[in-house]
């Protein structure tokens, strides 16, 4: 997250981290039920660990943390790497969470966000595109949902209904390492960090997010059948 601020501890209890090896963060994720996460489909890896209830970027133990393995990764059937359409994936964890003040699911928004809606994006991603500076703790950033027209003007030929743009003034954006993390608007999960330009946080180059309102049925059906 570029030019965000430290999240309050336990204020994003649905925020997850996907880790390679013992503790290398590569993507964010969102807890949506006691045993299921959502992340971006482009975050798919054959082997990874899941960390929930953690505030710090470092692997130091925190009392609220819970660690899991992913036993099933189900990318949306319409996703085709390295495209951006339908960029979401369900992950089933090896067990259910212990519900606590640090670890809680978030409800998915059934209605699509409208222009001007204020939202919160969070993640442990780099705070500067070209230098890979990492925050000490989870970062939060208020962003505003942009109109479809402005979104399409920013990225001609690249935007479809499975995406929405959100941003703020130049200098504030999600960035590398935030992929798959949550965009929460009015207390409900509206999007996932998906893509954007490089470097992050350029004028007229907003972040682009998976438009989860388009996928509520697929998410429910897939969880029920697995």
């Amino acid at each position: 997250i570029v030019n965000g601020s430290d999240c309050q501890k336990d204020a994003q209890p649905w925020q997850g981290a996907l880790l390679l090896g013992p503790n290398k963060l590569y993507c964010g994720a969102v807890l949506i039920s006691p045993q299921w996460l959502l992340t971006a489909a482009h975050c798919r890896k054959p082997v990874f660990r899941i960390r929930l209830g953690h505030h710090s970027m470092s692997p130091v133990y925190e009392s609220g943390q819970q660690m899991f393995q992913g036993i099933k990764s189900i990318p949306h059937p319409g996703y085709s790497h390295p495209g951006h359409s339908n960029d979401l994936m369900l992950i089933k964890m090896n067990r259910k969470i212990r519900d606590s003040h640090s670890v809680k699911p978030v409800e998915i928004a059934c209605d699509c966000a409208t222009e001007g809606t204020r939202c919160m994006v969070s993640g442990w991603g780099t705070t500067s595109s070209s230098h890979n500076n990492f925050p000490k703790v989870l970062q939060c950033l208020n962003i505003t949902v942009l109109s479809e027209e402005r979104c399409k003007n920013s990225y001609p030929g690249q935007i479809d209904k499975t995406m929405f743009c959100a941003g703020d003034e130049e200098g504030r954006d999600s960035c590398q390492g935030d992929s798959g993390g949550p965009v929460v608007c009015n207390g409900k999960l509206q999007g996932l960090v998906s893509w954007g330009d490089f470097p992050c946080a350029q004028r007229n180059r907003p972040g682009v997010y998976t438009n989860l309102c388009e996928f509520v049925k697929w998410i429910k059906d897939t969880m029920n059948s697995n």
Partner: antibody
Framework: QLQLQESGPGLVKPSETLSLTCTVS??????????WSWIRQPPGKGLEWIGN???????YYNPSLKSRVTISVDTSKNQFSLKLSSVTAADTAVYYC????????????????WGQGTTVTVSS | EIVLTQSPGTLSLSPGERATLSCRAS???????LAWYQQKPGQAPRLLIY???SRATGIPDRFSGSGSGTDFTLTISRLEPEDFAVYYC????????FGGGTKVEIK
């Protein structure tokens, strides 16, 4: 299948500007999933990254060459170009163009498609 | 600037043998941001490994990558005749750079 082809003069005089073009076929340059790179290799030596250009035309250059390098894109021709000014004999090399992939995960996908390279000699 | 040092400079081995190539960074590099390439004479480099340990499309499983921090390794479990080439590591954690290369030659 995506292919990259470098083109440009094989001989450049010292102090002049080296200009090369990379033509992309079998795919489109204006894609928000990819960046486009120039890399060079002096005779008998290793690889040196020169710079990248991204979807919006934003660029990222090797700090040691930054003052002399310009990378640009012409989407109408599906080409991107390299200009290196004030060349010396040390700029004699095989110049490669390549494609890399990027997203907002914290992950480097490497450069998966390369041109075959074009030899540029700097000599009077 | 992150400097990558590859060793050995030349590795003389026979087909069927195991090759272990080292890449050492002057400062810590995220393993997610390290790649390996193979280059044969007169050809462009070919991507072998990305993210330190993931094989690129079409790369046989005799090639494997490992490591973290400042020390990374490319291993070729059983050398085939077509594997004799120069191998480069690359980091993209900060301003991208390549190692000096390791030549794997027939003994």
């Amino acid at each position: 299948q995506l292919q990259l082809q470098e083109s440009g003069p094989g001989l450049v005089k010292p102090s002049e500007t080296l200009s090369l073009t990379c033509t992309v076929s079998g795919g489109s340059i204006p894609s928000s999933s990819y960046y486009w790179s120039w890399i060079r290799q002096p005779p008998g030596k290793g690889l040196e990254w020169i710079g990248n250009i991204y979807y919006s035309g934003s660029t990222y250059y090797n700090p040691s060459l930054k003052s002399r390098v310009t990378i640009s894109v012409d989407t109408s021709k599906n080409q991107f170009s390299l200009k290196l000014s004030s060349v010396t004999a040390a700029d004699t090399a095989v110049y490669y163009c390549a494609r890399g992939e990027y997203d907002r995960s914290y992950y480097f996908w490497g450069m998966d498609v390369w041109g075959q390279g074009t030899t540029v000699t700097v000599s009077s | 600037e992150i400097v990558l040092t590859q060793s050995p400079g030349t590795l003389s081995l026979s087909p069927g043998e195991r090759a272990t190539l080292s890449c050492r960074a002057s400062q810590s590099v995220s393993s997610s941001y390290l790649a390996w390439y193979q280059q044969k004479p007169g050809q462009a480099p070919r991507l072998l490994i990305y993210g330190a340990s993931s094989r690129a499309t079409g790369i046989p499983d005799r090639f494997s990558g490992s490591g973290s921090g400042t020390d990374f390794t490319l291993t070729i479990s059983r050398l085939e005749p077509e594997d004799f080439a120069v191998y480069y590591c690359q980091q993209a954690f900060s301003s991208p750079s390549f190692g000096g290369g390791t030549k794997v030659e027939i003994k």
